[in-house]
Interface confidence: low
Amino acid sequence: QAVPPYASENQTCRDQEKEYYEPQHRICCSRCPPGTYVSAKCSRIRDTVCATCAENSYNEHWNYLTICQLCRPCDPVMGLEEIAPCTSKRKTQCRCQPGMFCAAWALECTHCELLSDCPPGTEAELKDEVGKGNNHCVPCKAGHFQNTSSPSARCQPHTRCENQGLVEAAPGTAQSDTTCKNPLEPLPPEMSGTMLM
């Protein structure tokens, strides 16, 4: 089995990931591994010479680049925050800040926007991946309520008055909790059956 550099008449190389075709000499040469770049190009008698990327630069893939890519910070103005630092083999990993979703995507997220509020009586449908899309608000299921306008508030179960030794004064709705009262407390005048003489 030939070791780079080797002649190639059909302009293809055996290992597409780790080799590339060099048209000037019509040969297959080694690519440089992740974290490195080409410091000297290959020739018919010498294979590619690779060097390690300098600090604050990277190359993610097997490559024949003569430079490393500059590490870029996550831009907080665009609503991004860092989840993993840049290394010689990987660019800075960013995600949308809490309460935001990715509004523009080009191989990676370029900027995030604030999640829409879900109105009272609803909650944001849970997604597989946080930050991938805007909120889709769904109604609270039966026996639950949510009483704020918020991008992240969850519907809570209605209070069960009997669990607290109380009785129900007013039933809960999708937007409000059950109102409980002491069983010994009289009903307010407008709710009692008193007759005026």
Epitope: V77, M78, A103, A104, W105, H111, E113
Partner: nanobody
Framework: DVQLVESGGGLVQPGGSLRLSCKAS????????FGWYRQAPGKQRELVAT???????WYDVSVKGRFTISRDNAKNTVYLQMNSLRPEDTAVYYC??????WGQGTLVTVSS
Amino acid sequence: DVQLVESGGGLVQPGGSLRLSCKASGTTFSDRAFGWYRQAPGKQRELVATISTAGLTWYDVSVKGRFTISRDNAKNTVYLQMNSLRPEDTAVYYCNTFRGNWGQGTLVTVSS
């Protein structure tokens, strides 16, 4: 469904300027982020600039300082002001809503 119509392309000399427009219909315009992409002959489509609903902008390093993206919510239109144009800016320019909607594009040719 969202319809996008780009216009404003043409032939311009190096160093010249053009203003591209993207008119959107069939969507609540102010609720959408928009971006301008370009595709040069034989190359992949690349993102050039984006603008969020709040007006936050992002530019690719190749156009930063030369191109300006803006939006007019009243006119349902996104613009790309392109100054100091170079031959390598030659491409078909497309606008996009980041939800799979593409227009037909407008050709920009920078040549002397």
